[in-house]
Interface confidence: medium
């Protein structure tokens, strides 16, 4: 009724001293590798020569911090960020930051980034969109209330409002260019 070698689980590491034989009823606790977090029970139990329980390690890391218009990241750049790691932004002059200066990797998702707004209410260049472009020549600065229009590349369909407007130093939500479904 004893159990032999410990079962292995992806990204899980057994804690304590490894043994050749485990007695019935004996429990072994696992911990997760860096960037991973235990989802559910962390131990296995030896019952009737078999191990019961399945520790599951979930990847809680983040990649690619959110892009913030008119800002740059001032903290250390990493290829992978563990949960709890923070990334700090700074606005380019003359933009002013509104919102939390930092984003945090929270169990695999980034928290909401700040915005960098021009205190005069002006906007920078319109945000680029995938598979689409603005119909006018892009300027470096746009006056408050000015607007631009987007158009999609061939075979792509526009979703949302094609016109965006500069309000309080921020552009309104740009449209998306979607590939039409092929049946």
């Amino acid at each position: 009724t004893d159990c032999l070698s410990l079962p292995s689980f992806e990204n899980a590491i057994p804690m304590g001293e490894k043994k050749d034989v485990y007695k019935a009823g004996e429990q072994v606790t696992y911990t997760c590798a860096t960037y991973y977090k235990m989802d559910g029970a962390s131990n296995v139990t030896c019952i009737n020569s078999r191990w019961t329980g399945r520790p599951t390690c979930r990847d809680t890391s983040c990649v690619n911090p959110p892009t913030v218009q008119n800002a740059y990241i001032v903290s250390r750049q990493m290829s992978k960020y563990p949960s709890g790691e923070r990334v700090r932004y700074q606005c380019r002059s003359p933009y002013e930051m509104f919102g939390d200066e930092e984003v945090m990797c929270l169990n695999g998702n980034w928290t909401e980034p700040p915005q960098c707004k021009d205190s005069t209410g002006k906007c920078g260049p319109p945000p680029p969109i995938d598979n689409g472009d603005i119909t006018s020549f892009p300027l470096s600065v746009y006056a408050p209330a000015s607007s631009v229009e987007y158009q999609c590349q061939n075979l792509y369909q526009l979703e949302g409002n094609k016109r965006i407007t500069c309000r309080n130093g921020q552009w309104s939500e740009p449209p998306k260019c979607l590939h039409p479904c092929v049946i």
Partner: antibody, heavy 117, light 107 residues
Framework: QVQLQESGPGLVKPSQTLSLTCTVS????????VYWIRQHPGKGLEWIGV???????EYNPSMKSRVTISKDTSKNQVSLKLSSVTAADTAVYYC???????????WGQGTSVTVSS | DIQLTQSPSSLSASVGDRVTITCKAS?????LHWYQQKPGKAPKPLIY???NLASGVPSRFSGSGSGTDFTLTISSLQPEDFATYYC??????????FGAGTKLELK
């Protein structure tokens, strides 16, 4: 460990300016934003405003004209000033640290303010 | 501005019960946070960003939802869970708002 403590007068006369201080320890105001929240007797929570780590402020639109939040990083203090107070400003005032995503992780114990002549 | 409507406003339950509190936003939101408050005390964070348990919070608490509908669930009510619960939202384009609260009382 992280702590926030509100202080200020418990009684303020109508039309005067309410001044409260939040003294923090266990973290730096250059790294975290601090919120002010209030709670009227027997009622829910109301956001007053926030001062971000970089010093920019945001206020509840309903109180914006009367509120000023500032900080002295060297003293680890955040201050709240609320002008032209009335009996409707009678509440428990809390300061709280920003966690991320506009959530609060650590709160002060609150300070009770009564507006009365 | 986005309004948060909590239901029920009060709830009577017994130790061991499974309890669900809902928070409905007037328009779609990305994140919602939950707090617990006991009489005479400051609120305490329970759940961040819809489903992430705050530090030191027992696993009997869980959060879920998306869009406009969110829930806080207590799988097996304990004596220390009787309190008032608040949901909260804030985005870069909306003021920070709290729900009106749900008072959880002993049946």
């Amino acid at each position: 460990q992280v702590q926030l403590q509100e202080s200020g007068p418990g009684l303020v006369k109508p039309s005067q300016t309410l001044s409260l201080t939040c003294t923090v320890s266990g973290f730096s105001l250059t790294n975290y934003g601090v919120y002010w929240i209030r709670q009227h007797p027997g009622k829910g929570l109301e956001w007053i405003g926030v001062i971000w780590s970089g010093g920019t402020t945001e206020y509840n639109p309903s109180m914006k004209s009367r509120v000023t939040i500032s900080k002295d990083t060297s003293k680890n203090q955040v201050s709240l000033k609320l002008s032209s107070v009335t009996a409707a400003d009678t509440a428990v005032y809390y300061c709280a640290r920003n966690f991320g995503n506009y959530a609060m992780d650590f709160w002060g114990q609150g300070t009770s303010v009564t507006v009365s002549s | 501005d986005i309004q948060l409507t909590q239901s029920p406003s009060s709830l009577s339950a017994s130790v061991g019960d499974r309890v669900t509190i809902t928070c409905k936003a007037s328009s779609s939101v990305t994140y919602l946070h939950w707090y617990q408050q006991k009489p005479g005390k400051a609120p305490k964070p329970l759940i961040y960003a819809t489903s992430n348990l705050a530090s030191g919070v027992p696993s009997r608490f869980s959060g879920s939802g998306s869009g406009t509908d969110f829930t806080l669930t207590i799988s097996s009510l304990q004596p220390e869970d009787f309190a008032t619960y608040y949901c909260q939202h804030r985005s870069s384009s909306n003021p920070l708002t709290f729900g009106a609260g749900t008072k959880l009382e002993l049946k």
